[in-house]
Interface confidence: low
């Protein structure tokens, strides 16, 4: 896993430029883990980055992800997750120039190298759940969330609001 060293390469200037005409409200460096406390890790393999969901040993450092928060341009129909009636969206970047992307055709979550402005596939609507958990809904495919499937991240369709609390789409953010 490369997360810590990769994140240290960030500079403020990199993230001060506007993305699709919007600048981040704020940014936040955190490790990402599942509801069941498995860590989300990133590894360089064959010149591409792979994403894993795994148990870390006690002394292993968690990878960090830079979350950039944005206000959407469209009013939110939801209550509680919005910013003054607008949806709150995030991009997730574990290392410089790489962002998590939703591949809706393959129902997969991938790390892509890209330049700004970022494509819509890199934006996720952030839902604020109980017990310090969040979930990430695809901007490009409402009702589809980042989730855990077979020790990997995948896109999971949630067909009703009752299933929003399904454990496999809940994630924890931590600064340690």
């Amino acid at each position: 896993a490369f997360g810590i060293s990769g994140v240290q390469k960030y500079t403020r200037a990199l993230h001060d430029s506007s993305i699709t005409g919007i600048s981040p409200i704020t940014e936040y460096l955190a490790s990402l883990s599942t509801y069941n406390d498995q860590s989300i890790t990133f590894a360089l393999e064959d010149e591409s980055y792979e994403i894993y969901v795994e148990d870390l040993k006690k002394d292993e450092k968690k990878d960090k992800v830079l979350l950039s928060y944005y206000e959407s341009q469209h009013p939110s129909n939801e209550s509680g997750d919005g910013v003054d009636g607008k949806m709150l969206m995030v991009t997730l970047s574990p290392t410089k120039d790489f962002w998590l992307h939703a591949n809706n055709k393959e129902h997969s979550v991938e790390l892509h190298k890209c330049e700004k402005p970022l494509p819509d596939q890199a934006f996720f609507v952030l839902h604020n759940m109980h017990s310090n958990c969040v979930s990430f809904e695809c901007k490009t495919d409402p009702g589809v969330f980042i989730g855990v499937k077979d020790n990997h991240l995948a896109l999971i369709k949630v067909d009703s609001s009752e299933n929003l609390c399904t454990e496999n789409i809940l994630f924890k953010l931590s600064e340690t």
């Epitope: 704020t26 936040y28 955190a30 997750d81 919005g82 910013v83 310090n132 931590s174 600064e175």
Partner: nanobody
Framework: QVQLVESGGGLVQPGGSLRLSCAAS????????MGWFRQAPGKEREFVAG????????LYADSVKGRFTISRDNAKNTVYLQMYSLKPEDAAVYYC????????????????WGQGTQVTVSS
């Protein structure tokens, strides 16, 4: 602009209890650490209690330890201060505060303040 709106203040007898609430108009978690401060007439604003933004770790002023409990409901964008065994010296205007950092505790580091709610402790 983050707006913090406090409620729950009022008049209570010594030994009584109150629960203060602070609702945020904008998304809190995980951007802001939240806290409560108070200011009595003629005194400086002081830290009462704080709660970290990504954990339930709490911090209290010595004067309220064991009597006050801070908590947050991230899904409701609300932070609470449950106050037990109130004393006359607890009387003050209580302010909700938010800081764009992991912890909160120093009055000078607060990014956003509520308008305050009055707590009066008198028989």
């Amino acid at each position: 602009q983050v707006q913090l709106v406090e409620s729950g203040g009022g008049l209570v007898q010594p030994g009584g209890s109150l629960r203060l609430s602070c609702a945020a108009s904008r998304f809190i978690f995980p951007i802001y650490a939240m806290g409560w401060f108070r200011q009595a007439p003629g005194k400086e604003r002081e830290f009462v209690a704080g709660i970290e933004r990504t954990t339930d770790t709490t911090l209290y002023a010595d004067s309220v330890k064991g009597r006050f409990t801070i908590s947050r409901d991230n899904a409701k964008n609300t932070v609470y201060l449950q106050m037990y065994s109130l004393k006359p010296e607890d009387a003050a205007v209580y302010y909700c505060a938010a800081r764009n950092s992991r912890r909160i505790g120093d009055v000078n580091d607060v990014d956003y303040w509520g308008q305050g709610t009055q707590v009066t402790v008198s028989s």
